[in-house]
Interface confidence: medium
């Protein structure tokens, strides 16, 4: 089979594929699984030994416009007595996701896929000790 | 949809909400370049609720390979390095958006898909249910 020219993929392209201008892709932002719900254990952000708070960031030129960010409440971790133990560290767990960014250039609008970094929660870790030589 | 401010001098035909289908520049912009990846890639071993990473592959999705976290223990690791079953390791889950090729096999036509991934684990105090 002949290798297709750049701009095509390497499997047979079905005849029904929508035409797309060069340098761009057609993206349907009607989300598959839109109504899927996170079934995380109840209020783990408060019950964790590395608890965190949530804040919502809002950007009208981003899709989705609402992104929730977590922030660790403490530097250390909460021990069995409910006190902060600074011999351990609360650290953020981060996750990248894709968003669609809308850009206005004069009267025209362009769209760009973008990776954004979301802090999802926190975990308690043993610190790395750096010994000074 | 979401409403956005529009340049008042522009013709009124433009929808203020995000349209259902958009033409998107092919290259994916990385807003996190100064912090990416800021991760300490050994958190999954150093955590009191450690996790393993499992490969999930789907050739019709971008990214095709996603590594999912699975907590190693039901309990958490205590100061002696043993599993303490008075505490629970639980996954931290997050919905992320990925690209799904739609219709399948079409080279430049995609749909956003929301998927639930386990990113890591955290140690929590268990919820104790008292039997009446």
């Amino acid at each position: 089979r002949k290798i297709p020219k750049v701009g095509h993929t390497f499997f047979q392209k079905p005849e029904s594929c929508p035409p797309v201008p060069g340098g761009s892709m057609k993206l349907d932002i009607g989300i598959i699984n839109e109504n899927q719900r996170v079934s995380m254990s109840r209020n783990i952000e408060s019950r964790s030994t590395s608890p965190w708070n949530y804040t919502v960031t809002w950007d009208p030129n981003r899709y989705p416009s609402e992104v929730v960010q977590a922030q660790c409440r403490n530097l250390g971790c909460i021990n069995a007595q409910g006190k902060e133990d600074i011999s351990m560290n609360s650290v953020p767990i981060q996750q990248e996701t894709l968003v669609v960014r809308r850009k206005h250039q004069g009267c025209s609008v362009s769209f760009q896929l973008e990776k954004v970094l979301v802090t999802v929660g926190c975990t308690c870790v043993t610190p790395v000790i750096h010994h000074v030589q | 949809g979401i409403t956005i401010p529009r340049n008042p001098g522009c013709p009124n035909s433009e929808d203020k909400n995000f349209p259902r289908t958009v033409m998107v520049n092919l290259n994916i912009h990385n807003r996190n370049t100064n912090t990416n990846p800021k991760r300490s890639s050994d958190y999954y071993n150093r955590s009191t609720s450690p996790w393993n990473l499992h490969r999930n592959e789907d050739p019709e999705r971008y990214p095709s390979v996603i590594w999912e976290a699975k907590c190693r223990h039901l309990g958490c690791i205590n100061a002696d390095g043993n599993v303490d079953y008075h505490m629970n390791s639980v996954p931290i889950q997050q919905e992320i958006l990925v690209l799904r090729r739609e219709p399948p096999h079409c080279p430049n036509s995609f749909r956003l898909e929301k998927i639930l991934v386990s990113v890591g684990c955290t140690c929590v105090t268990p919820i104790v249910h008292h039997v009446a």
């Epitope: 095509h8 390497f10 | 990416n36 050739p59 095709s64 390979v65 996603i66 430049n108 890591g120």
Partner: antibody
């Protein structure tokens, strides 16, 4: 284990074209990117361009634009690099390299080259 | 395009010694800087990704640091097998570019 196996050494005449292949095994071929990097004798590494199979697009370094074409065939998990209008300056070892394009531990792990082919030596001489 | 400069060009080192190679970018590239080792007549091998993140199978004596424009590769306790040329690579902005390389040989 991921392996990238390249086609054999080539001797070419100035003005002719070159097409070398890179056969991938062990891993999601469609999911990762393949870049081509060359190294002239005694010189450093020079990125020529790369393709992301999932999207089917290729990016090229300005220096090679119009002269290089990078393609891939998913059915044979093989990437190709074609370079036209060869001159003696194109004498080099040509490497294919994998960009993982994975979602690892919360991050897109991408845009570095974690596996390399063994290299294809190309000599352009009359 | 982003220009990467490495120093030194060449270093002759005794085994067990500490080696430090620096890489400077012509503009801010965040942490999108990777390090490779190339031994004579071999393909390059990834050592460090994203400035400071270790790579599976690479000995722990190799470490990286830095962000923005200034980066460092450190080999703590050089071994004879570490002889070769070390390249930095930026992937923040296309085209990908590489540093000119630092040749390390064993005394």
């Amino acid at each position: 284990e991921v392996q990238l196996v390249q086609s054999g050494a080539e001797v070419k005449m100035p003005g002719s074209s070159l097409k070398i292949s890179c056969k991938a095994s062990g891993g999601s071929f469609r999911g990762y990117g393949i870049s081509w990097v060359r190294q002239a004798p005694g010189q450093g590494l020079e990125w020529m361009g790369g393709i992301t199979p999932f999207f089917g697009w290729a990016d090229y370094a300005q220096k090679f634009q119009g002269r290089v074409t990078i393609t891939a065939d998913e059915s044979t998990t093989t990437a190709y690099m074609e370079l036209s209008g060869l001159t003696s300056d194109d004498t080099a070892v040509y490497y294919c390299a994998r960009d993982p394009n994975e979602f690892w531990n919360g991050y897109y792990d991408t845009h570095h080259f974690d596996y390399w082919g063994q290299g294809t030596t190309v000599t352009v001489s009359s | 395009e982003i220009v990467l400069t490495q120093s030194p060009d060449f270093q002759s080192v005794t085994p067990k010694e500490k080696v430090t190679i620096t890489c400077r970018a012509s503009q801010d590239i965040g942490s999108a800087l990777h390090w490779y080792q190339q031994k004579p007549d071999q393909s390059p091998k990834l050592l460090i990704k994203y400035a400071s993140h270790s790579v599976s199978g690479v000995p722990s004596r190799f470490s990286g640091s830095g962000s923005g424009t200034d980066f460092t590769l450190t080999i703590n306790g050089l071994e004879a097998e570490d002889a070769g040329t070390y390249y930095c690579h930026q992937s923040d902005i296309l085209p990908h570019t590489f540093g000119p390389g630092t040749k390390v040989d064993i005394k």
